[in-house]
Amino acid sequence: QDSRGCARWCPQDSSCVNATACRCNPGFSSFSEIITTPMETCDDINECATLSKVSCGKFSDCWNTEGSYDCVCSPGYEPVSGAKTFKNESENTCQDVDECQQNPRLCKSYGTCVNTLGSYTCQCLPGFKLKPEDPKLCTDVNECTSGQNPCHSSTHCLNNVGSYQCRCRPGWQPIPGSPNGPNNTVCEDVDECSSGQHQCDSSTVCFNTVGSYSCRCRPGWKPRHGIPNNQKDTVCEDMTFSTWTPPPGVHSQTLSRFFDKVQDLGRDYKPGLANNTIQSILQALDELLEAPGDLETLPRLQQHCVASHLLDGLEDVLRGLSKNLSNGLLNFSYPAGTELSLEVQKQVDRSVTLRQNQAVMQLDWNQAQKSGDPGPSVVGLVSIPGMGKLLAEAPLVLEPEKQMLLHETHQGLLQDGSPILLSDVISAFLSNNDTQNLSSPVTFTFSHRSVIPRQKVLCVFWEHGQNGCGHWATTGCSTIGTRDTSTICRCTHLSSFAVLMAHYDVQEEDPVLTVIT
């Protein structure tokens, strides 16, 4: 103990009262007012606590300190007196700071500063909004992507800083009386073709599309090599039969003379002469096949190659030429039996039937046209009886299914095994050259020589081989039936067709369908 009678063990933040007692300093408190044991402590009194008697007044905050407290002005306020701290409401001189006046650049670009009690806000200019991550920064509202759809569907929205425009799309123009830019702009498609605003080459036909146009080759013309059709810069050339030339490796004066005629017709050809040119080509083909001359001395395989080449080329040339014909039905026939039936129409929704002496073809008009092709729809059928001479002994390649069927219902091949051509060879074509998988089948009715009793007939088409030759095939064609001198074929593609008689011997007749006379 202290000789002066003061306790030496008083806890921190306390002072002794006498030799056996202590009291907490001002701003501190203990469990009891007088501390009698060194175990007790003095804790800071929080004068700023809710139940405290301290009141700092408005626009201010109370800050507790060790053993005391301070009153300070709240953020956004400052003391008029200049004193940073004070002790009670009577000393409070806090008033609002006008941040907008202090710092005119507070709201940066595109915003106006608005003072509020203790703070400020930024009011964005029209066409701007506050950035969520920086509430003091105004950014441009993109009206075009905000989902407001401020523009008419005939225009496209163009965002500007603080605003937007509704502009006509390329190839569109404001409707009469409409502005071009404000949000009430309404536009319409410019018909570049009728207004003369297109740049189509004279070898093409202008075709208006929504918001644009394209240039398509005139009927009977084709795109220049390497230039696609249906573009703004398409340039076409007259279809001058340039691809229909003698097949390589075939030496025949008769064939050369035929192709000389074809090339002459090609050189002189003009779209207005389509009808005459078709007739001249068929006349030349009819004459060639009536008197094949040295073609008949060629090996069989070469004869088949020539036939394949003639059929393929004829189809392409007739398709091209017929697009220049006016609407209607044409029938031409020639001395050796070559026959052409052709129907040209603006597309109509019905079935078309082409009748010839030895063949009838029936199919839907909607097969004829490629979608989007502006030209007329053409359906054509050529009967070429003379082609049979060149196709004698041509091979037949059967699908495994039909091969098996023939072997099951027949004893097997007889004699030399080559099928006999019963009918004329016919070639069918459309203005649409994509005819490998017709959405609706084509039906052919062939008239032909009598079928030898107990022999089966086959509906076949000429499949052009990659070697430039080809063979008879049945894929995609079914034989609906045959009755003596008439056979009906149903096919899902177009090509050159015929009816063959297979040299098989019938094993058995189905007793159920045996005719009772």
């Epitope: 079935s351 039937t353 009838v360 029936q362 199919l363 839907d364 699908e399 495994p400 299914e401 039909k402 098996m404 069927l405 099951e408 219902t409 959405s439 609706s440 089948p441 084509v442 039906t443 009715t445 089966k456 079914s478 034989t479 609906i480 039936g481 045959t482 009755r483 008439s486 009906i488 149903r490 189905d510 159920v512 369908l513």
Partner: antibody, heavy 121, light 111 residues
Framework: EVQLVESGGGLVQPGGSLRLSCAAS????????MHWVRQAPGKGLVWVSR????????NYADSVKGRFTISRDNAKNTLYLQMNSLRAEDTAIYYC??????????????WGCGTLVTVSS | QSALTQPASVSGSPGQSITISCTGT?????????VSWYQQHPGCAPKLMIY???YRPSGVSNRFSGSKSGNTASLTISGLQAEDEADYYC???????????FGGGTKLTVL
Amino acid sequence: EVQLVESGGGLVQPGGSLRLSCAASGFTFRSYWMHWVRQAPGKGLVWVSRISSGGSTTNYADSVKGRFTISRDNAKNTLYLQMNSLRAEDTAIYYCARGDNYYDSPYFDYWGCGTLVTVSS
Amino acid sequence: QSALTQPASVSGSPGQSITISCTGTSSDVGGYNYVSWYQQHPGCAPKLMIYEVSYRPSGVSNRFSGSKSGNTASLTISGLQAEDEADYYCSSYTSSSTYVVFGGGTKLTVL
């Protein structure tokens, strides 16, 4: 004796599926075109689909195209009709019928007794 | 709506002859000789009676005959008998994607 026996019919909800079978006997099944023909209660006959002897060629009525699939298993002498996305208007007796044994002739010389398909919720 | 048109019903007395017509278009009946006729008794499967316009399968009575003129085919039953009472359907090959079309059926009543 030629026999065609259909099975697999029953009650199904709209949008559901069924697979019909037709067991063939008494003839060389693999040599014949086969067909399905249906008949709604109290109504006429409607051709549905056909398949060639080896199964390579198939064809469907427009009303079932894309929903029905015809197939065959020549080893089991069985014809099938897989029917998906069924509608109330598909309710009918489904007959399996034999076509020609060589040509694709449009007449049917033997028919099964049929199996009833009912599409209803 | 059937593709081929048949009368809904016909009737005749035993021993009489009746004719059922079947009218189509040039794309079916008129275009091809592939008209068939089927007989169907109530609750039974159809039976082929005539194929290719006028041919009878074996086992079919020669009282049944078929013919065609233009776009209309006909089935004639002579010497009508009680067992002939049934529904009769015509069918034809068609050049459309449908392949074969049927008539709506004709109910034959033997009085």
